[in-house]
Interface confidence: low
């Protein structure tokens, strides 16, 4: 139904009084500068707020910061600046919060110019207490926690040293010099690149990739001639310079760098780049930049080895290295991704895939929307989504698309309806089925967030004027109520809710401005009394994901299986609750050729689902390097799509061929690797 407050909208009874009793204001005794907010742990209610204020003096900049702590989801805050000895905290390092529910926090302090090293404040009790520690180095990066053990930290120094602590920052040891980039892998492994000659920049393309599995006691060189490296899912990628020219290629390892294979991806030149768009334990989406300053490239999807790639999407919008791409993983439905393409006429269009990059289509036009001026045909057009690129271009888009794994099927995004993205003021659209169908949810740009696993959606209008009104919906954005949370409007700066969308609290941040001063203020609203009762079985309904034709036996089959979810009925106004777990029932589907990708040396002719041998490779030695060794590759031409669970049905059996291969790239072969110990 169309948004609004017509008769069809069941209004929540007495919501003003209920919300007024649950609205908590906190005025911060602070001059307005910058504010950063971090949640400490999951479901703990602990929030840390760091405010900083710079006073530019004639000779130097004087900085002041304050630290506040809440343990009730932001309803009340306590000034705990004295716990960090009133020290000025460097905001560029942020607040380093430990993984999971470790309760660990590291703050990096500003120190005076002549000091021997930096200073950190450490807490391991959810910021109730802090310990000051002076460092034997000046940090260049934020402290990085090992995902497996929150006592293990690593940091790079301004002198390019790699420093490790095994006791949560109490004691530090430099384990390697001349380090450019370092990352934690699995099992407390550290991967890092080193330079030999002058600097990271000078040695780009001649770096070495190292690994230590024992926090610096011993090392192994696992790659040379490295340009860069990255981790994604269970894959380790290295971009390696070719022997003869300035091109480079991607090599991939699934055993922490012991053995490498050359990815069957195009090589790139000096001005081009590779980018891992998304990765999981099954596969990876890889963007390969086009030659020249085109602003686009090609998306490839990998097989389960990360070696064989299928072209997924042409003309994928991605500006220069480290630039902007709209590629978005829709986390509320398996297999769904949204991104933008740059068409021949330089307009930008949104594409969506429901099957992990197998096929891409335009987004269906919302039923309650008209095609805008970009549409050639006023009856036929698509929805186009504003994401990172639009935000970078300073369009009136306050937020990127939003989805949450536990709010099944819900996607919220700014968009326009036409033949391409429009520069006009966008509206907010919602999908409740993972992107198959869309409805205009709110007129004009808004900030939005999902609470109680989708039971409540909250929005605030994006305006340059002070605001005092919040909107909320209990039926997935069909109907909206408005609530005035304060008499005195504030200059709005952001909405904050606990990550994971399980909370029923929302904090509205902003500042008040008077003739003399401006102060930070937050309003935390608890919606628990709006959703008065806990949801029961009758409040949920069965929903088949990816359903497009209920009469078709294969309806809902994506990557070899279909999933039925129990979803909250739109008409039910009740609490999913913090312990809500998504209930889903998978059913295995029959295999079809769509469940297979073509193996190396094979391709799919257009509009054909069969894999045929590439004519140019018939009878040739193939440029295919598996684990860096000369060996036969046997294939039947098909390989199951990563993560595909189909059974029975079509089983493509082909004559097994020996694809003779030579290793044209063996910079990463095992015999070139070496080890050393400290």
């Amino acid at each position: 139904s169309a948004p609004g407050e017509d008769e069809e909208c069941g209004r929540v009874r007495d919501f003003v009084a209920k919300l007024a009793n649950n609205t908590h204001q906190h005025v911060f005794d602070d001059l307005r500068g910058s504010v950063s907010l971090s949640w400490v742990g999951d479901s703990t209610g602990v929030i840390l707020v760091l405010t900083t204020f710079h006073v530019p003096l004639v000779i130097m900049t004087f900085g002041q910061s304050k630290l506040y702590r809440s343990e009730d989801y932001g309803k009340n805050f306590k000034d705990i600046t004295d716990l960090i000895n009133n020290t000025f905290i460097r905001t560029e390092f942020g607040m380093a919060i430990g993984p999971e529910n470790s309760g660990k926090v590291v703050l990096t302090a500003e120190v005076s110019g002549g000091s021997r090293g930096g200073r950190i404040f450490r807490s391991s009790d959810f910021a109730k207490n802090f310990v000051q520690t002076d460092l034997p180095f000046h940090p260049l990066t934020q402290m990085m926690y090992s995902p497996q053990n929150s006592d293990y930290l690593l940091a790079l120094s301004t002198e390019n040293g790699l420093w490790v602590s095994k006791n949560f920052g109490g004691k530090w040891e430099e384990i390697h010099k001349a380090v450019c980039l370092a990352k934690w892998g699995s099992d407390n492994t550290i991967f890092f690149t080193t330079y030999a000659n002058g600097s990271c920049k000078a040695d780009l393309g001649a770096l070495e990739l190292w690994r230590t599995s024992d926090l610096g006691k011993s090392f192994k060189t696992i790659g040379v001639k490295i340009y860069s490296f990255g981790l994604g899912g269970r894959f380790l990628f290295a971009s390696v310079m070719a022997d003869k020219d300035t091109t480079r290629r991607i090599h991939v390892s699934t055993d922490q760098g012991d053995t490498w294979s050359m990815a069957q991806l195009p090589s790139v030149g000096q001005e081009q780049f590779y980018s891992i768009l998304a990765a999981n334990d099954d596969m990876v989406f890889m963007h390969v930049d086009e030659p020249g300053d085109t602003g686009f490239g090609t998306i490839f999807t990998s097989d389960d080895r990360g070696i064989v790639y299928s072209k997924s999407l042409d003309r994928h919008l991605y500006t220069t290295t480290g630039g902007e791409t709209d590629f978005t993983n829709v986390t509320s439905l398996r297999g769904v991704y949204i991104t933008s393409v740059l068409s021949e006429d330089n307009s930008i269009q949104t594409m969506i895939t429901f099957d992990q990059g197998g096929r891409w289509t335009h987004l269906r036009k919302p039923e309650n929307s008209e095609c805008d001026a970009t549409a050639k045909n006023k009856n036929e057009c698509s929805l186009h989504i504003h994401a990172s690129y639009s935000i970078s271009q300073k369009l009136n888009v306050p937020m990127a698309p939003l989805s949450e794994p536990n709010a099944v099927g819900i996607v919220i995004a700014h968009g326009s309806v036409g033949d391409a993205i429009s520069v006009m003021v966008p509206d907010v659209y919602i999908s409740d089925d993972g992107g198959y169908s869309w409805t205009k949810m709110l007129e004009g740009p808004h900030y939005y967030t999902i609470l109680d696993s989708g039971g409540i959606i909250v929005a605030i209008e994006h305006s340059s004027r002070p605001i005092n009104v919040i909107k909320f919906s209990t039926d997935e954005g069909q109907c909206w109520q408005t609530y005035t949370f304060t008499r005195d409007p504030i200059y709005f700066t952001g909405l904050a809710s606990e990550p994971g969308a399980r909370s029923m609290n929302i904090s509205i941040w902003g500042f008040t401005e008077s003739f003399l001063t401006s102060q930070w203020v937050s309003y935390t609203i608890d919606f628990k009394d709006i959703l008065e009762r806990n949801c029961e079985e009758k409040d949920y309904t069965i929903w088949l994901a990816h359903s497009t034709d209920p009469e078709d036996y294969e309806d809902g089959c994506i990557l070899g299986y279909k999933e039925q979810f129990l979803r909250l009925r739109k008409s039910s106004v009740c609490q999913n609750g913090r312990d809500y777990v998504v209930t889903k029932q998978p059913s295995i589907c029959l295999c079809s050729l769509e469940d297979f990708l073509c193996d190396f040396g094979y391709y799919r002719p257009e509009n054909d689902s069969k894999c045929v041998e590439q004519p140019e490779l018939k009878g040739h030695d193939l440029e295919f390097c598996l684990y860096g060794r000369e060996e036969h590759l046997t294939t039947n031409g098909y390989r199951k799509i990563p993560g595909d669970k189909c059974q029975g049905g079509v089983n493509p059996v082909r004559e097994v061929k020996d694809l003779k291969k030579k290793c044209t790239s063996n910079f990463l072969s095992p015999e070139k690797q070496n080890s050393k110990s400290n």
Partner: antibody
């Protein structure tokens, strides 16, 4: 009205073959998956095979795999079950049943009797 | 294969009674279960799908409940046309499997 009518059941010797048909007037046959289910003399039900709406995909129970073939002719609105290498344990009343993604045994036929005996 | 254990195999009941038939799946099947009715000498009729959903045209005295591995079909206020055999069927995964059936007989 949706109806399914099976035919082709007969008395056949072990090792013999038989082809069952299921006529499906009254609905858009080509948009539904179809199953064969049999009911043994002791009234137990056993799912035999399924075929997708377009006929591209088939799946069989282990007891009939390699011996039975399910197929369909959407132009004729007819479902088939080709049975070969028949055994005495294949003796049953055979029903065809309409499937959809939401409900696999939606509408049933009246059944046809297959007896395998020497 | 998923084994569907249906009980009781038969029961004697009177008009107006409320009866419950249960089915236990050997592994979790969420709500992927249906209930069928077979009248003597006749074919089958679908009653309930997805565990709890009543098929169009089926009287509201029939209801289904349960999810995971334990399910039941309840007939409240039994009528004369309800004396029949009832079967559960799981369609969570291949091969689809049926319960052994429950015969409702007149007391």
């Amino acid at each position: 009205e949706v109806q399914l009518v099976e035919s082709g059941g007969d008395l056949v010797k072990p090792g013999g073959s038989l082809k069952l048909s299921c006529a499906a007037p009254g609905f858009t046959f080509s948009t539904y998956g179809m199953s064969w289910v049999r009911q043994t003399p002791d009234k137990r039900l056993e799912w035999v095979a399924i075929i997708s709406s377009g006929g591209s995909y088939t799946y069989y129970s282990d007891t009939v795999k390699g011996r039975f073939t399910i197929s369909r002719d959407n132009a004729k609105n007819t479902l088939y079950l080709q049975m070969s290498s028949l055994k005495s344990e294949d003796t049953a009343m055979y029903y065809c049943s309409r499937s959809s993604s939401h409900w696999y045994f939606d509408v049933w036929g009246t059944g046809t009797t297959v007896t395998v005996s020497s | 294969d998923i084994l569907m254990t249906q009980s009781p195999s038969s029961m004697s009941v009177s008009l107006g009674d409320t009866v419950s038939i249960t089915c236990h799946a050997s592994q979790g099947i969420s709500s992927n279960i249906g209930w069928l009715q077979q009248k003597p000498g006749k074919s089958f009729k679908g009653l309930i799908y997805h565990g709890t959903n009543l098929k169009d045209g089926v009287p509201s005295r029939f209801s289904g409940s349960g999810s995971g591995a334990d399910f039941s079909l309840t007939i409240s206020s039994l009528e004369s046309e309800d004396f029949a055999d009832y079967f559960c069927v799981q369609y969570a995964q291949f091969p689809y499997t049926f319960g052994g059936g429950t015969k409702l007989e007149k007391r």
